[in-house]
């Protein structure tokens, strides 16, 4: 059959027609529509938006659009009993209280149902005690406190600045250190870029602005009460004491005006070095406790939030494939927001909406993709990636057999400097080739390709003339597809200049000030960066769904596997004596990587030469490509993290947002010098090398000639 059997226009024209149909003005309109009221997960407003999107996707021309609902554990503040933190004197009187809400932005003063800042899933409690400042509350920060500075956090309330790592890791670290409460705050050093005004006059965080967010440590479990299975009507739910990933100590976020009041009184030790100092006019003393005249004062937390099983709704749209309807390419992003969601998620949802509209337009003209495209508007992402994970749990058997790729579509922008891509190595060549065909939206790059501006502004640290592409971590809805199911995944957005802007994320992240006006006035007035992101995300989906041979290059996996093996070997070689003592060898891993490289090379040669008009051989070769990512899945999962099953990549155990390579070996080696039983610890290193070597070898064999 001809290569364009699914369509009445030539393949090249298809992509051009699809891309030409994408309009910045539409994205702008959709963003405005999605951001006028809050769309908190589990609320009526978000259910109404789900129904609106369902209706519009049907109008756009999708074959079917369904709502998929689940009853999951969510968390909300108590409306009549607000959360706050106080400084109390020796008589127990509250002499200072933190604010109960963010001052609303201009034009939004009369909006109801703005959830006040809170840490989702915090338990209730009113702990009081001395304060310890723990910097970013990273693993290394607690090592510094406990091992170097000899400061014991047990029984203390810790105050940590947001940034660098996922907030859930901060809370986990504080719990392990014995803290009885955690205060999270946004320091201007991380959330106030120099030379830029505070919202509403600029894109910086005002002193009363606060970052909301969940503080779970789910490790990919989804709904805390139904790990591994969908939270459907007949679900068996765990008791709250057995729920996955819930914090055990009260946690609350504050802005930097309130943080100043707490930090200015800190006594105890000076900060260990400049990396512990933020930008407030305080000494950043670590504590414990307050200084001098204030030494009898304590900090008290008042947390009254509740966890509630609540219904959530995903919107799932289908555009049936004409040739391979049983092969799924998925484009998904979340719909729920903390407040208005001006950037997170609606800048992404608006792009998805426009991509759906463009695909629908082509379909109405008689075109169909070769493979089925699924579009998803996920719910409850902010509460732990719940909507996407529950849906994937419900459909796991279909997905593991039919899932070709997943493209994530959360926030389209976190800056307006250059492109940022994280994806499986299988997609490197797809991303390179696509961005070479797209126009750069950047000033000074008129008439140049996106690839050129991206490479210039964000060069690869390893390969000259190529752009940086990062490892997938987590903290977004691709997690279940990639880390649990082994479906090739990628994400793309416009980002800031990481070299000049050292703040974490974007300043107004998860605050009430994340509005439509923030985007329209300060980030992307022409919506040209949104359009570019739509072209990248949409273009990737188009190619994945429509190319005759899947646009995956297994040789790129071989290259990174060698790089990752070299890296983990060099980490282990910091302990040469122990490696000798316990006979630790990486030979099996390097041998497996070598075999993978040779087999991938031969497979790529066959891919060039085979008869593409033979549908059986074509399907066979495509299946080998599709199932390669799946081959890196270990059904037993990583130690203590059963839902992180990818052997090559997992979210870092110290920062959910970051990806770690050969995570099993990495975690076994981490802090190994402090382990009480070195023989056992090095035995686990050897076991993890064995698992990794076996998995790489097994994956290589899936690319061998089938007979």
């Amino acid at each position: 059959k001809s290569s364009n059997e699914a369509t009445n226009i030539t393949p090249k024209h298809n992509m051009k027609a699809f891309l030409d149909e994408l309009k910045a003005e539409n994205i702008k309109k959709f963003l405005y529509n999605f951001t006028q009221i809050p769309h908190l997960a589990g609320t009526e407003q978000n259910f109404q938006l789900a129904k609106q999107i369902q209706s519009q996707w049907k109008e756009f021309g999708l074959d079917s659009v369904e709502l998929a609902h689940y009853d999951v554990l969510l968390s909300y503040p108590n409306k009549t009993h607000p959360n706050y933190i106080s400084i109390i004197n020796e008589d127990g009187n509250e002499i200072f209280n933190t604010s109960l809400f963010e001052p609303p932005p201009p034009g939004y003063e009369n909006v109801s149902d703005i959830v006040p800042p809170f840490s989702a899933f915090s338990p209730q409690g009113m702990p009081e005690g001395d304060l310890v400042y723990v910097n970013y509350a990273r693993t290394e920060d607690f090592f510094k406190l406990e091992r170097d500075m000899k400061i014991n956090c047990s029984g203390k309330i810790v105050i940590a600045r947001y940034g660098k790592v996922f907030r859930g890791n901060k809370v986990k670290n504080a719990q392990l250190a014995g803290a009885k409460g955690v205060i999270l705050y946004s320091d201007p050093a991380d959330y106030f870029a120099p030379g830029v005004k505070s919202y509403p006059d600029g894109w910086n965080l005002p002193g009363g602005g606060v970052q909301r967010g969940n503080i779970l440590n789910l490790n990919g479990a989804g709904d805390p009460l139904t790990p591994g299975y969908p939270a459907n009507e007949y679900a068996y739910r765990r008791g709250i004491a057995e729920a996955v990933g819930l914090p055990s100590i009260p946690v609350h976020p504050i802005g930097y005006y309130d943080a100043q009041k707490l930090l200015e009184k800190m006594g105890g030790s000076a900060p260990p070095d400049s990396s512990w100092r933020g930008s407030l006019k305080v000494p950043y003393n670590v504590g414990p406790g307050f200084t001098g005249n204030f030494s009898t004062q304590k900090v008290k937390m008042h947390i009254h939030s509740t966890n509630e099983v609540t219904r959530i709704y995903n919107v799932i749209g289908t555009l049936r494939g004409a040739v391979e309807p049983d092969r799924y390419v998925i484009l998904g992003g979340h719909r729920d927001s903390w407040v208005f969601g001006g950037i997170d998620p609606q800048s992404g949802a608006a792009v998805v909406h426009e991509i759906v509209r463009s695909f629908g337009t082509l379909k109405k003209e008689g075109w169909r993709p070769r493979r089925t495209i699924l579009f998803a508007s996920w719910d409850a992402e902010e509460f732990g990636l719940l909507g996407s994970t529950e849906w994937a749990e419900e459909n796991s058997r279909l997905l593991q057999e039919r899932g070709v790729a997943y493209i994530n579509a959360d926030s389209s922008i976190e800056g307006n400097y250059t492109l940022r891509v994280d994806c499986t190595p299988l997609m490197y060549s797809l991303v390179h080739n696509l961005t070479k065909e797209l126009k750069s939206p950047d000033e000074g790059f008129e008439g140049k390709s996106l690839y050129e501006s991206w490479t210039k502004k964000s060069p690869s640290p390893e390969f000259s003339g190529m752009p940086r592409i990062s490892k997938l971590g987590s903290g977004n809805d691709f997690e279940v597809f990639f880390q649990r199911l082994g479906i090739a995944s990628g994400r793309a957005r416009y980002t800031k200049n990481w070299e000049t802007n050292k703040f974490s994320g974007y300043p107004l992240y998860h605050s009430v000030y994340e509005t439509y006006e923030l985007v329209e006035k300060f980030y992307d007035p022409m919506f040209k960066y949104h359009l570019t992101v739509a072209q990248v995300r949409g273009g990737m989906v188009f190619e994945l769904a429509n190319s005759i041979v899947l646009p995956f290059d297994c040789r790129d996996y071989a290259v990174v596997l060698r790089k990752y093996a070299d890296k983990i070997y060099s980490i282990s070689m910091k302990h040469p004596q122990e490696m000798k003592t316990y006979s630790v060898s990486f030979d099996s891993l390097f041998s497996a990587v070598k075999n993978f490289t040779e087999i991938a090379s031969k497979f790529s040669e066959r891919l060039q030469d085979f008869d593409k008009s033979n549908p059986i051989v074509l399907r066979m070769m495509n299946d080998q490509l599709m199932f390669l990512e799946r081959a890196f899945i270990d059904p037993l999962g990583l130690p203590d993290r059963p839902f992180y099953r990818h052997v090559i990549y997992a979210p870092s155990s110290h920062n959910k947002y970051a990806g770690e390579s050969f995570p099993g070996i990495y975690d076994a080696l981490f802090d190994i010098e402090s382990k009480v039983d070195p023989s056992k610890a090095w035995g686990e290193v050897k076991r993890q090398i064995y698992v990794a070597a076996f998995t790489v070898q097994a994956a290589a064999e899936t690319l061998s000639e089938v007979a």
Epitope: K144, D148, A270, D273, N285, G292, N293
Partner: antibody, heavy 115, light 107 residues
Framework: EVQLVQSGAEVKKPGASVKVSCKTS????????IHWVRQAPGQSLEWMGN????????TYNQKFQGRVTITVDKSTSTAYMELSSLRSEDTAVYYC????????WGQGTLVTVSS | DIVMTQSPDSLAVSLGERATLSCRAS??????VDWYQQKPDQSPKLLIY???TRHTGVPDRFTGSGSGTDFTLTISSLQAEDVAVYFC?????????FGAGTKVEIK
């Protein structure tokens, strides 16, 4: 056993610079703060600055007005202290110390500044 | 800068007797005080941190106490090997500052 071994004695002319090294062993280098302290003949101890070997974060004593630079080389577990624009009053024994509380000390390096 | 004032400048104590060394901070430093021992032609050694916690391997005849501005190092029963100069240091604020030292001798 934790050890800090410093480079040998130096004689410098006024206006010159000196760079003293401190090679550590017996512990995880990135875990402990490295401080530099000096002691003029017959005098007390004077803190010059410190570094977090994990991320290179430094704090200096303002008294040295940008004359001091502290660095580390993680690959060799070595810390360095460079003092520029030397004057005669910089003649002292310079110590490195590991640990926030100066838990472990080097043997000291005598720097003599003389024309 | 916080000034650490040690007294006395020197102290002569009989073997087996108690030696009490004083250190006063010019402002409140909480308990962020260390004590060091320096023997002739040697590097200093950490004795006490957080005003009262003995460093690993330090004999229990050395005791630190105090908080705020007044701190004391006590050697409960002076031994010959305790002859040295003892320095206090504050680490409550930068720059970290040492006292001028107290010289302990045998009477």
């Amino acid at each position: 056993e934790v050890q800090l071994v410093q480079s040998g004695a130096e004689v410098k002319k006024p206006g010159a610079s000196v760079k003293v090294s401190c090679k550590t062993s017996g512990y995880t280098f990135t875990e402990y703060t490295i401080h530099w302290v000096r002691q003029a003949p017959g005098q007390s101890l004077e803190w010059m600055g410190n570094i977090n070997p994990n991320n290179g974060g430094t704090t200096y004593n303002q008294k040295f007005q940008g004359r001091v630079t502290i660095t580390v080389d993680k690959s060799t577990s070595t810390a360095y202290m460079e003092l520029s624009s030397l004057r005669s009053e910089d003649t002292a024994v310079y110590y490195c110390a590991a640990g926030w509380n100066f838990d472990y000390w080097g043997q000291g390096t005598l720097v003599t500044v003389s024309s | 800068d916080i000034v650490m004032t040690q007294s006395p400048d020197s102290l002569a104590v009989s073997l087996g007797e108690r030696a009490t060394l004083s250190c006063r901070a010019s402002q409140d430093v909480g308990t962020a005080v260390d004590w060091y021992q320096q023997k002739p032609d040697q590097s200093p050694k950490l004795l006490i941190y957080w005003a009262s916690t003995r460093h690993t391997g330090v004999p229990d005849r050395f005791t630190g106490s105090g908080s705020g501005t007044d701190f004391t190092l006590t050697i409960s029963s002076l031994q010959a090997e305790d002859v040295a100069v003892y320095f206090c240091k504050q680490y409550n604020s930068y720059p970290l500052t040492f006292g001028a030292g107290t010289k302990v001798e045998i009477k």
